[in-house]
């Protein structure tokens, strides 16, 4: 059968028809519809939205649209017993209390069910004690405090500014340092861009604005009570004491008005250097405790949130493939939000909605994709990627045999400067080729390609004339597909200018001020950036689902493997004497990378030459491409992180958002000079080199001629 027998139009025309059908006005309309009330995971409002999306996807023309529900552990503030932080005097009287809610934005004063700022999954507790300011609470910040400044956080309440790393890592670091509570706050240095007004007059964070977010350290486990398995009706659930990734100390977020009141009184040590100073008019003293006049005052946390097993709902839509219905290309993004979700997630969900509508329109005209496309609206992403992970756990056997690719679709924008792409190296050429065909929405690039504006604004640090494409980390719903199952994955969104805007994320992230108006007034009034992101995400899905030969280039993996091997070798070479003493050699890894490079090159040559009209050979070659990502999976997982199984990439152990290459070796080498037993530590480095070399070699062999 010809791969285009299901349609009477050529592949090129199909893509054009699909892209031409995408409309900015529709994305705008969908965004408005999705953001009028909160859609917190586990609430009735979010269930109703799931049913609405199910109904609309059916209307758009998908073959089937089902709800997949799971009962997972979620966390909510106590409605009658609010969370707050106080300063108490020596008599125990509360002389200052932090605010209980964010002042609602104009037009939303009468909206009910706005969840107050809280740190999801914080345990209950009312610790009191001296405060220690720990900067961003990164690993290196605690090293600075404990090793250089000799400041002990044991038994202290620490206050950390948001930014740089995932908040769960901050809490884990504080726990390991012995802290008994954590206060998270947004510093204007990170969440207030100079020259821009606060919301509602601009896109900056007002002093009363607060970032919500979960503080789990799940390491890919999904529902904390059912790691590895779906949280279905007959699930066996762990006791709360055995739950995965829950913090052990109370945590609470505040805005910078409240942070000012806590930080202005700080005494003790001065900040070690300017990188510890934010933009508030406070000394940024580290502590511990308050200065002279206030030294008898303490900080007290009052946290009463509860963890509850709650039902969540994914929406799963199917567009059956005409030729290879057992090959799945997945487009997924989450639906649940902390409050209105103006950017996160609904700017992404609106784009998915329009992509589904466009595919549905083509289908109604008689077209079908070559491969099956699955569309997903995930629930409870904000509570630890729970909806996507539970669904993938339930369908893991199908996915590992049939999953071609996963394209993520959370927030479409985090700025309006240029494109940002993170993906497997297998997709580099797909992204390059697609963006060369799309028009740039950027001012000053009229008539130019997206590739051109992207390359100009975000050049690759290694290859001139090419754009930067980053490693996949985590913190979003692709995690289970890529890091656990080894399905080729990618994500794209419009981003800020990282050179000039040094704040972390976008200022109003996870606050009540993330509204439709924020997007429509300040970020993308014409919805042209949303449309571009829809074209990139949709175009990738189209190509992955419809191209006769999968648009994966294994040679690009060879290039990055060499780069990553060089990088990890240079890290190890900071310990030349130990490498000699313990006979540490990277020869096996470099040899495996060399073999991979040669075999990938030969495979690519065969890919150009084989008979594409032979369906068996075509399927065989495509399977080798599909299963290449899978070949990088180690069934045993990484040390202490069994659900992170990809040997080439994992979320950084120090920042879930960031990707790390050769993570097993990297973690074995990290801070190795502080391992009390160097013999054991370097033995683990050697073991990790062995695992990496074996995996690269084994992956290379999957590309060899089959017989």
């Amino acid at each position: 059968k010809s791969s285009n027998e299901a349609t009477n139009i050529t592949p090129k025309h199909n893509m054009k028809a699909f892209l031409d059908e995408l409309k900015a006005e529709n994305i705008k309309k969908f965004l408005y519809n999705f953001t009028q009330i909160p859609h917190l995971a586990g609430t009735e409002q979010n269930f109703q939205l799931a049913k609405q999306i199910q109904s609309q996807w059916k209307e758009f023309g998908l073959d089937s649209v089902e709800l997949a529900h799971y009962d997972v552990l979620l966390s909510y503030p106590n409605k009658t017993h609010p969370n707050y932080i106080s300063i108490i005097n020596e008599d125990g009287n509360e002389i200052f209390n932090t605010s209980l809610f964010e002042p609602p934005p104009p037009g939303y004063e009468n909206v009910s069910d706005i969840v107050p700022p809280f740190s999801a999954f914080s345990p209950q507790g009312m610790p009191e004690g001296d405060l220690v300011y720990v900067n961003y609470a990164r690993t290196e910040d605690f090293f600075k405090l404990e090793r250089d400044m000799k400041i002990n956080c044991s038994g202290k309440i620490v206050i950390a500014r948001y930014g740089k790393v995932f908040r769960g890592n901050k809490v884990k670091n504080a726990q390991l340092a012995g802290a008994k509570g954590v206060i998270l706050y947004s510093d204007p240095a990170d969440y207030f861009a100079p020259g821009v007004k606060s919301y509602p007059d601009g896109w900056n964070l007002p002093g009363g604005g607060v970032q919500r977010g979960n503080i789990l350290n799940l390491n890919g486990a999904g529902d904390p009570l059912t790691p590895g398995y779906p949280a279905n009706e007959y699930a066996y659930r762990r006791g709360i004491a055995e739950a995965v990734g829950l913090p052990s100390i109370p945590v609470h977020p505040i805005g910078y008005y409240d942070a000012q009141k806590l930080l202005e009184k700080m005494g003790g040590s001065a900040p070690p250097d300017s990188s510890w100073r934010g933009s508030l008019k406070v000394p940024y003293n580290v502590g511990p405790g308050f200065t002279g006049n206030f030294s008898t005052q303490k900080v007290k946390m009052h946290i009463h949130s509860t963890n509850e097993v709650t039902r969540i709902y994914n929406v799963i839509g199917t567009l059956r493939g005409a030729v290879e219905p057992d090959r799945y290309v997945i487009l997924g993004g989450h639906r649940d939000s902390w409050v209105f979700g103006g950017i996160d997630p609904q700017s992404g969900a609106a784009v998915v909605h329009e992509i589904v509508r466009s595919f549905g329109t083509l289908k109604k005209e008689g077209w079908r994709p070559r491969r099956t496309i699955l569309f997903a609206s995930w629930d409870a992403e904000e509570f630890g990627l729970l909806g996507s992970t539970e669904w993938a756990e339930e369908n893991s056997r199908l996915l590992q045999e049939r999953g071609v690719a996963y394209i993520n679709a959370d927030s479409s924008i985090e700025g309006n400067y240029t494109l940002r792409v993170d993906c497997t190296p297998l997709m580099y050429s797909l992204v390059h080729n697609l963006t060369k065909e799309l028009k740039s929405p950027d001012e000053g690039f009229e008539g130019k390609s997206l590739y051109e504006s992207w390359t100009k604004k975000s050049p690759s640090p290694e290859f001139s004339g090419m754009p930067r494409i980053s490693k996949l980390g985590s913190g979003n719903d692709f995690e289970v597909f890529f890091q656990r199952l080894g399905i080729a994955s990618g994500r794209a969104r419009y981003t800020k200018n990282w050179e000039t805007n040094k704040f972390s994320g976008y200022p109003l992230y996870h606050s009540v001020y993330e509204t439709y108006e924020l997007v429509e007034k300040f970020y993308d009034p014409m919805f042209k950036y949303h449309l571009t992101v829809a074209q990139v995400r949709g175009g990738m899905v189209f190509e992955l689902a419809n191209s006769i030969v999968l648009p994966f280039d294994c040679r690009d993996y060879a290039v990055v493997l060499r780069k990553y091997a060089d990088k990890i070798y240079s890290i190890s070479m900071k310990h030349p004497q130990e490498m000699k003493t313990y006979s540490v050699s990277f020869d096996s890894l470099f040899s495996a990378v060399k073999n991979f490079t040669e075999i990938a090159s030969k495979f690519s040559e065969r890919l150009q030459d084989f008979d594409k009209s032979n369906p068996i050979v075509l399927r065989m070659m495509n399977d080798q491409l599909m299963f290449l990502e899978r070949a990088f999976i180690d069934p045993l997982g990484l040390p202490d992180r069994p659900f992170y199984r990809h040997v080439i990439y994992a979320p950084s152990s120090h920042n879930k958002y960031a990707g790390e290459s050769f993570p097993g070796i990297y973690d074995a080498l990290f801070d190795i000079e502080s391992k009390v037993d160097p013999s054991k530590a370097w033995g683990e480095v050697k073991r990790q080199i062995y695992v990496a070399a074996f995996t690269v070699q084994a992956a290379a062999e999957t590309l060899s001629e089959v017989a």
């Epitope: 090793r147 250089d148 000799k150 012995g178 900071k574 030349p576 004497q577 502080s674 391992k675």
Partner: antibody
Framework: EVQLLESGGGLVQPGGSLRLSCAAS????????MGWVRQAPGKGLEWVST????????SYADSVKGRFTISRDNSKNTLYLQMNSLRAEDTAVYYC??????????WGQGTLVTVSS | DIQMTQSPSSLSASVGDRVTITCRAS??????LNWYQQKPGKAPKLLIY???TLQTGVPSRFSGSGSGTDFTLTISSLQPEDFATYYC?????????FGGGTKVEIK
């Protein structure tokens, strides 16, 4: 193999000075904190001083503060202890140690310092 | 400074005996407790760190336990080469401090 070799011990009069050296081999010296621990004849162990890998941070026992100075030369893989205003109670075997997280993981064989008139 | 108190200060035992030495800190040191062995005329040698982790090359008859303020070193079956003095040391906070030592002698 990690090795530490102390030298510079000997007999010195009260109020006198002595400089101990410790030559290190078998590990990347500049990556590790180093320290001195002493043991008076027939007595237990006493931590004397520690220095960070870069040499930027030092700490001392109260009993030697202001009199002893720890230093290192990473280019020579050598640790030093400059001991001034020596007292009879400083008489001890002085051990050089590689220090990881305040744990003395590897020790030299020691050098005897005797303060006596 | 944190005071470290070892007991007993000395003990007599026979080859094959199970020997237990205790170490008490004047305040909680969580699990930052290390044990060293010193033979006459020799430098000390690290046996156990972080209360219970055996250093590479140390025989498995040695084990450590405890947390907070009370810690134990156990030799499950005393061997001739184990007759020595044993010291505990806290590495929780500077200045680091040692216990007074426990001398294990042949009965």
């Amino acid at each position: 193999e990690v090795q530490l070799l102390e030298s510079g011990g000997g007999l010195v009069q009260p109020g006198g000075s002595l400089r101990l050296s410790c030559a290190a081999s078998g590990f990347t010296f500049g990556n590790y904190a180093m320290g001195w621990v002493r043991q008076a004849p027939g007595k237990g162990l006493e931590w004397v001083s520690t220095i960070s890998g870069s040499g930027g941070s030092t700490s001392y026992a109260d009993s030697v503060k202001g009199r002893f100075t720890i230093s290192r030369d990473n280019s020579k893989n050598t640790l030093y202890l400059q001991m001034n205003s020596l007292r009879a109670e400083d008489t001890a075997v002085y051990y050089c140690a590689r220090v990881i997280r305040q744990v003395a993981t590897t020790w030299g064989q020691g050098t005897l310092v005797t303060v006596s008139s | 400074d944190i005071q470290m108190t070892q007991s007993p200060s000395s003990l007599s035992a026979s080859v094959g005996d199970r020997v237990t030495i205790t170490c008490r800190a004047s305040q909680s040191i969580t699990s930052y407790l290390n044990w060293y062995q010193q033979k006459p005329g020799k430098a000390p040698k690290l046996l156990i760190y972080d209360a219970s982790t055996l250093q590479t090359g140390v025989p498995s008859r040695f084990s450590g336990s405890g947390s907070g303020t009370d810690f134990t070193l156990t030799i499950s079956s005393l061997q001739p080469e184990d007759f020595a003095t044993y010291y505990c040391q806290q590495s929780y906070i500077t200045p680091v401090t040692f216990g007074g030592g426990t001398k294990v002698e042949i009965k």
